[in-house]
Amino acid sequence: PTSSWNISSELNKDSYLTLDEPMNNITTSLGQTAELHCKVSGNPPPTIRWFKNDAPVVQEPRRLSFRSTIYGSRLRIRNLDTTDTGYFQCVATNGKEVVSSTGVLF
């Protein structure tokens, strides 16, 4: 029991979660492609979720998608429309801590 407690303590001591760069606001044109980048690092590797206007982002085949990257996560929106305007937020967690960043797409 003592040794397992020590291992657990070491894991907790080494865990971290950092927002490496705040998300930028993005201005683009109708029909273009926008990319929003969530730049976070952590241990354990963080889980990242995307929100638009405080609601989970709805992925759309061939138009709106997000995926993990070496720096965190990237949200890509193709064929932009005015209706895509809004607040985009990424929320990252490593199970212990939570960090988030918000950008506005105009």
Epitope: T27, F51, K52, D54, A55, G86, F106
Partner: antibody, heavy 119, light 107 residues
Framework: EVQLVESGGGLVQPGGSLRLSCAAS????????IHWVRQAPGKGLEWVAA????????YYADSVKGRFTISADTSKNTAYLQMNSLRAEDTAVYYC????????????WGQGTLVTVSS | DIQMTQSPSSLSASVGDRVTITCRAS??????VAWYQQKPGKAPKLLIY???SLYSGVPSRFSGSRSGTDFTLTISSLQPEDFATYYC?????????FGQGTKVEIK
């Protein structure tokens, strides 16, 4: 305390102009979308226009595009709706409203100002 | 354009009744739906946001729920001050779309 106060409504003839004001206080004005929403007598709510004051980004409903202009003065914490070529169907109570900090719906509304377009 | 189809357009109920109003979105709006209450001559007031979150200061008899693209506002026990018109709104797709409204009248 967050407050939005509209003014500038009144009676105007068809083809005339009017400028509405929305004075904001109690929050960082430039960092929120400010919208104008109208309600014709006995009818539902209709979105009219929006602006993000910090960048001057503007958006319009098709029904008012080319006739109405939304603007904002961040030094005065005030949004404006310039209404030209007014029509009878523009008769309504006009509300300004704030989108929440994460875009979470219209969390604050003004009291409204009545615009009547009639000869 | 995204449509929010609200029903019923009006209903009659008594104090103490449980009242349910529904809105159906024409496409996915995630959980970005709000409900507002409006009384004659007054501005709308936010009741529910994010489909089911109760806005600050709103009585707990009001609740919201979501099932796919169907959204429901429930008043568990209607009070005299609840007689008003209620609107749903999606705000996932800018600039948002309102339902047609539901007038709750005294039976």
């Amino acid at each position: 305390e967050v407050q939005l106060v509209e003014s500038g409504g009144g009676l105007v003839q068809p083809g005339g102009s009017l400028r509405l004001s929305c004075a904001a206080s109690g929050f960082t004005f430039g960092s929120y979308f400010i919208h104008w929403v109208r309600q014709a007598p006995g009818k539902g709510l209709e979105w009219v226009a929006a602006i993000f004051p910090a960048g001057g980004y503007t958006y319009y409903a098709d029904s008012v595009k080319g006739r109405f202009t939304i603007s904002a003065d961040t030094s005065k914490n005030t949004a404006y709706l310039q209404m030209n070529s007014l029509r009878a169907e523009d008769t309504a109570v006009y509300y300004c409203a704030r989108y929440g900090s994460m875009g979470g719906a219209f969390d604050y509304w003004g009291q409204g100002t009545l615009v009547t377009v009639s000869s | 354009d995204i449509q929010m189809t609200q029903s019923p357009s009006s209903l009659s109920a008594s104090v103490g009744d449980r009242v349910t109003i529904t809105c159906r979105a024409s496409q996915s709006v995630s959980s970005a739906v709000a409900w507002y209450q409006q009384k004659p001559g007054k501005a709308p007031k936010l009741l529910i946001y994010s489909a089911s979150s109760l806005y600050s200061g709103v009585p707990s008899r009001f609740s919201g729920s979501r099932s796919g693209t169907d959204f429901t506002l429930t008043i568990s026990s209607l009070q005299p001050e609840d007689f008003a018109t209620y609107y749903c709104q999606q705000y996932y797709w800018f600039p948002g779309t309102f339902g047609q409204g539901t007038k709750v009248e005294i039976k």
